[in-house]
Interface confidence: medium
């Protein structure tokens, strides 16, 4: 990887143990000001593999609310507006980082956690398994 | 919101200022052990709105590597394998949390940052703008 010289103005809270505990400022910097504010807000309805969004809430997690996509159909919507079962609606999943309160219920102590979330759905050609 | 009693065993590093600085253990707990490790690995090729994955690397960010999806086509792939421009391939975007080294190059001081990433693509019916 790239070696970057350490900034001499860093907080002096080095932990000899790795994996380490670090200081994190929860004042979120949002880099999304230059992106489309509408984003994919209506794609869930207009997609050929439409999905519903389900609220997943956990007060011990940061962010506490995550929206999970669930594909509405097994197949995909064709030009006539009908479900075509020769195609498959599948969830597009992504691993994201969240903060988990640890020990539980602590306001200022967290552990990084990786969770898998479904962001939306896409329409794919099914895998056909041929009998040997 | 739900009020949860504070755990008496929490680290005593309360900051009077909000937004606050918290302690985060970087020993990642992975909740994804029970999920399909392959996940959507081949959906990018089998989708009717296929995409390419581009590596975005930033040593000042954690995670330093993020993969960005770029839709391959303006339209969507039809049953004949041709691009149908009556439909539209669009990126499904998600806001994710990352840690940004702050001050820069510090190994143990971060700030939470929200970034928008394209996870994959879906096929949607285009918006038709009618002249009033």
């Amino acid at each position: 990887g790239i070696t970057i010289p350490r900034n001499p103005g860093c907080p002096n809270s080095e932990d000899k143990n790795f994996p380490r505990t670090v200081m994190v400022n929860l004042n979120i910097h949002n880099r999304n000001t230059n992106t489309n504010p509408k984003r994919s807000s209506d794609y869930y309805n207009r997609s050929t593999s439409p999905w519903n969004l389900h609220r997943n809430e956990d007060p011990e997690r940061y962010p506490s609310v995550i929206w999970e996509a669930k594909c509405r159909h097994l197949g995909c919507i064709n030009a006539d507006g009908n479900v075509d079962y020769h195609m498959n609606s599948v969830p597009i999943q992504q691993e994201i980082l969240v903060l988990r309160r640890e020990p539980p219920h602590c306001p200022n102590s967290f552990r990084l956690e990786k969770i898998l979330v479904s962001v939306g759905c896409t329409c794919v050609t099914p895998i056909v398994h041929h009998v040997a | 919101g739900i009020t949860i009693p504070r755990n008496p065993g929490c680290p005593n590093s309360e900051d009077k200022n909000f937004p606050r600085t918290v302690m985060v253990n970087l020993n990642i707990h992975n909740r994804n052990t029970n999920t399909n490790p392959k996940r959507s690995s081949d959906y990018y090729n089998r989708s009717t709105s296929p995409w390419n994955l581009h590596r975005n690397e930033d040593p000042e960010r954690y995670p330093s590597v993020i993969w960005e999806a770029k839709c391959r086509h303006l339209g969507c792939i039809n049953a004949d394998g041709n691009v149908d421009y009556h439909m539209n391939s669009v990126p499904i975007q998600q806001e994710i949390l990352v840690l940004r080294r702050e001050p820069p190059h510090c190994p143990n001081s971060f700030r939470l940052e929200k970034i928008l990433v394209s996870v994959g693509c879906t096929c949607v019916t285009p918006i038709v703008h009618h002249v009033a």
Epitope: T35, P37 | K70, H73, L74, N88, V90, C121
Partner: antibody, heavy 124, light 107 residues
């Protein structure tokens, strides 16, 4: 109604720099790719550069390394920073936007909306 | 780069005439071919996109056809406001190229 208004053109010496701006209104600017197209006096149209909704940039070979296309979605503005200008860069520069039908971050777009153009003259 | 060659480079016609302009690509551009009209001192105006789709507000005397490498713009009955220069453009392969233009003049 979609409106594109260019500014920043003028007379500049060879090797000099100029920054063109395009103010966009009447559509959700951040959702769409944008481009610059130029037309030398008495000549045909020539695509210069495109920036897609994701911020990815594409250039014609003759301007690569000299021109930089950028956007500020908060200001609904498109820019073209032109450095190391040559006599052959003399042209009317048009800001162009795709149709509102296609929202993808892809660059294969034609141009449904054009600005009035701004003249760039490179001469000593 | 994909080269687009328009023919003729210029033509003289009368009001009411049927006019056809052709655009030939030196390799296939699939269906990513579009047509513009430009009047002196004005910005180009989109007429036809994706070979044969008329832009909103474009009179139906303008039509497009073709596929692959050979494309046509037809004006079924030339009107006084149609005297202008017409350009084809491909967006199949970067750099997106334009034809050299066809000037339609009054006979």
């Amino acid at each position: 109604e979609v409106q594109l208004v260019e500014s920043g053109g003028g007379l500049v010496q060879p090797g000099g720099s100029l920054r063109l701006s395009c103010a966009a209104s009447g559509f959700t600017f951040p959702s769409y790719g944008m481009a610059w197209v130029r037309q030398a006096p008495g000549k045909g149209l020539e695509w210069v550069a495109t920036i897609d909704a994701a911020g990815d940039t594409y250039y014609r070979d003759s301007v690569k390394g000299r021109f930089t296309i950028s956007r500020d979605n908060a200001k609904n503005s498109l820019y073209l920073q032109m450095n190391s200008l040559r006599a052959e860069d003399t042209a009317v520069y048009y800001c162009a936007a795709p149709p509102q039908t296609y929202e993808g971050s892809i660059y294969r777009l034609w141009f449904a909306h054009w600005g009035q153009g701004t003249l760039v003259t490179v001469s000593s | 780069d994909i080269q687009l060659t328009q023919s003729p480079s210029s033509l003289s016609a009368s009001v009411g005439d049927r006019v056809t302009i052709t655009c030939r690509a030196d390799e296939s551009v699939k269906t990513l071919m579009h047509w513009y009209q430009q009047k002196p001192g004005k910005a180009p105006k989109l007429l036809i996109y994706l070979v044969s789709n008329s832009e909103i507000g474009v009179p139906d005397r303008f039509s497009g056809s073709g596929s692959g490498t050979d494309f046509r713009l037809t004006i079924s009955s030339l009107q006084p406001e149609d005297f202008a220069t017409y350009y084809c453009q491909q967006t199949y392969s970067a750099p997106h190229t334009f034809g050299q233009g066809t000037k339609v003049e009054i006979k």
